[in-house]
């Protein structure tokens, strides 16, 4: 039975040209996390494998940095980065848990703050 829950940063916003941390946290389960995948709509951004470390997709390698932890840092944001992001936790023996984050990249210099994991 899957007992775990994923807490995410939820809906967040950031300024164009800035950076943002995407973060998910799996709780309420003793399942072993074997891999975390980060996806943007239909593209894989990165994989963090428990044994092997980080794989950053070639199309994002200049703008994505691994971490902190199992999170992902997006840099040099553009308005095209606005959209849904997913963290997929592959666990044993539970299976797969998915979290969703919506990022809005603002042209304005006034980006909302207050998201739990947002870079100040």
């Amino acid at each position: 039975m899957m007992t775990g829950t994923i807490e995410t940063t939820g809906n967040i916003s950031a300024e164009k040209g800035g950076s943002i941390i995407l973060q998910c946290h799996l709780s309420s389960t003793t399942a072993q996390v074997t891999q975390v995948n980060w996806e943007q709509q239909d593209q894989l951004l990165a994989i963090c494998n428990a044994d092997l470390g980080w794989h950053i997709s070639p199309s994002f390698k200049d703008r994505v940095a691994p971490g902190p932890g199992l999170g992902l840092t997006l840099q040099s944001l553009t308005v095209n980065d606005t959209g849904e992001y997913f963290c997929i936790y592959h666990t044993y023996p539970d299976g797969t848990y998915t979290g969703r984050i919506f990022l809005e990249v603002l042209e304005s210099s006034v980006a909302e703050h207050g998201a739990r994991f947002q870079i100040p």
Epitope: N37, A50, L52, S57, H90
Partner: antibody, heavy 119, light 107 residues
Framework: DVQLQESGPGLVKPSQSLSLTCTVT?????????WNWIRQFPGNKLEWMGY???????SYNPSLKSRISITRDTSKNQFFLQLNSVTTEDTATYYC????????????WGQGTAVTVSS | DIVMTQSHKFMSTSVGDRVSITCKAS??????VAWYQQKPGQSPKLLIY???YRYTGVPDRFTGSGSGTDFTFTISSVQAEDLAVYYC?????????FGGGTKLEIK
Amino acid sequence: DVQLQESGPGLVKPSQSLSLTCTVTGYSITSDYAWNWIRQFPGNKLEWMGYISYSGSTSYNPSLKSRISITRDTSKNQFFLQLNSVTTEDTATYYCARFMITTFAMDYWGQGTAVTVSS
Amino acid sequence: DIVMTQSHKFMSTSVGDRVSITCKASQHVSTAVAWYQQKPGQSPKLLIYSAPYRYTGVPDRFTGSGSGTDFTFTISSVQAEDLAVYYCQQHYNTLWTFGGGTKLEIK
């Protein structure tokens, strides 16, 4: 250049253990990546069996978990496959391969060694 | 397990033709797919990784595309030396699985 070379007996009796060695040259197996065993059955189907990582951690195909063990000898830059309680269904060509984290794919393969399980 | 299905076991083509090989995943695998070429008597060789990226030294006549569950491997102009079996493989989760292979035959 990185090279992988499989070796071991070509014939194993049912219920016995299959033991294979992969010797790696041109790259240290403790430096990085995952060092895999993959087999190809008659008819061409490929099956990932498992790996030992650069740090020594292992990951196995759940369908084989009760029978498989992958170990290594870092001084000889070798890693090993042991498959217990074999049956004729384990007849295959066995490959060792390197899984590279930057491509997240198997970028170097050995030439393969054919193993027949028969009495 | 994620099942990777290559519906065509054999494909016949002529030198200079364009040919596309398809692979369908039983569930979403994003772009976590690689393609391998296995020539007769040889071990598999990596051609494409992360769906569209060519591995080092791979000729640009080989391309990959797709996302989610549907993937395509294309040879823009088939050469005689492309006679081989082509396999897709997913690495979306930690149980890596391969397609059954598509054997490319040259007329």
